[in-house]
Amino acid sequence: MMTGTIETTGNISAEKGGSIILQCHLSSTTAQVTQVNWEQQDQLLAICNADLGWHISPSFKDRVAPGPGLGLTLQSLTVNDTGEYFCIYHTYPDGTYTGRIFLEVLESSVAEHGARFQIP
């Protein structure tokens, strides 16, 4: 039975040209995290494998940095980066947990961080 929950940074906004940290946290389970995948829509951004470490998709090396922790840093943001991002936690024995973050990249300087929320 999957008892865990994923806490994410929720709906967030950031300025064009700036950086943002995407963070997820898996709680309420003793399952072992074997791998975390970060996706933008259906595109792979990065993988953090418990045994092998980070793999950054070659398509995104110029704009993605690993961490902090299991999170991911997006740099040099453009308005095209607006959209859904997913952290996919592969765990044993529970299976897969998925968290969703919506990022809005703004032209103006009034970008504010949204509230944190949980996805069961």
């Epitope: 791998q35 995948n37 792979l44 494998n49 045994d51 398509s59």
Partner: antibody, heavy 117, light 113 residues
């Protein structure tokens, strides 16, 4: 020990398709990418694309998009590449190789494909 | 696409001599986050598949003799064989794996006099 065993030599007709395999052993198949590389005499090494058996991810060199199709079967730890609409330009040795982040560290022995009528 | 320019295309040396192979990338291969250059060197002996010698520009693969050394960062890279042995007869390729599509140099054929 890590092994990548590729299927045998193929002699095929122009216009047909061929599907070759890359059977792996000695490591966790779903943790590593499998890359495919083409080698023709006098043309060096050409990267075709890669597939990540632990997810639904694959990437193609635009030059081979529509020509090559990469798949993987996790139950048998085997990767496959199908080449379609074959011409003499597709006559080559095709290699599979294992990759994570640091390099293509183990290679198969290659599959030779000859396209001839 | 990133173009890998490799030189020389061939060279003939005597056993015991030092060999230097150069590789120049059309784009920077240094990833700022880990300060590693995504450049590998492969050796391909006649009738065999390529074998990894060096990755991240300068890290020697396990089991590779220490006469093989990789150096360089960013766009300019070198493979050095400090004292060539007869068994080093092969074609040597550089490869970038910084960005898709991965690309190889055209190869350097090493012949033994």
């Amino acid at each position: 020990q890590v092994q990548l065993q590729q299927s045998g030599t193929e002699l095929v007709r122009p216009g047909t398709s061929v599907k070759m395999s890359c059977r792996t052993a000695g490591y966790t198949f779903t943790n590593y990418w499998i890359h495919w590389v083409k080698q023709r005499p006098g043309h060096g090494l050409e990267w075709i694309g890669d597939i990540y058996p632990g997810g639904r991810y694959s990437n193609y060199n635009e030059k081979f998009r529509g020509k090559a199709t990469l798949t993987a079967d996790t139950s048998s730890s085997t990767a496959y590449m199908e080449l379609s609409s074959l011409t003499s330009e597709d006559s080559a040795i095709y290699y599979c190789a294992r990759y994570y982040e640091s390099a293509m560290d183990f290679w198969g022995q290659g599959t030779s494909v000859t396209v001839s009528s | 696409d990133i173009v890998m320019s490799q030189s020389p295309s061939s060279l003939a040396v005597s056993v015991g001599e030092k060999v230097t192979v150069n590789c120049k990338s059309s784009q920077n291969l240094l990833y700022n986050s880990n300060q590693k250059s995504y450049l590998a060197w492969f050796q391909q002996k006649p009738g065999q598949s390529p074998k990894l010698l060096i990755y991240w520009a300068s890290t020697r693969e396990s089991g590779v003799p220490d006469r093989f050394t990789g150096s360089g960062s960013g766009t300019d890279f070198t493979l050095t064989i400090s004292s060539v042995k007869a068994e080093d007869l092969a074609v040597y390729y550089c490869q970038q794996y910084y960005n898709y599509p991965f690309t190889f140099g055209s190869g350097t054929k090493l012949e033994i006099k």
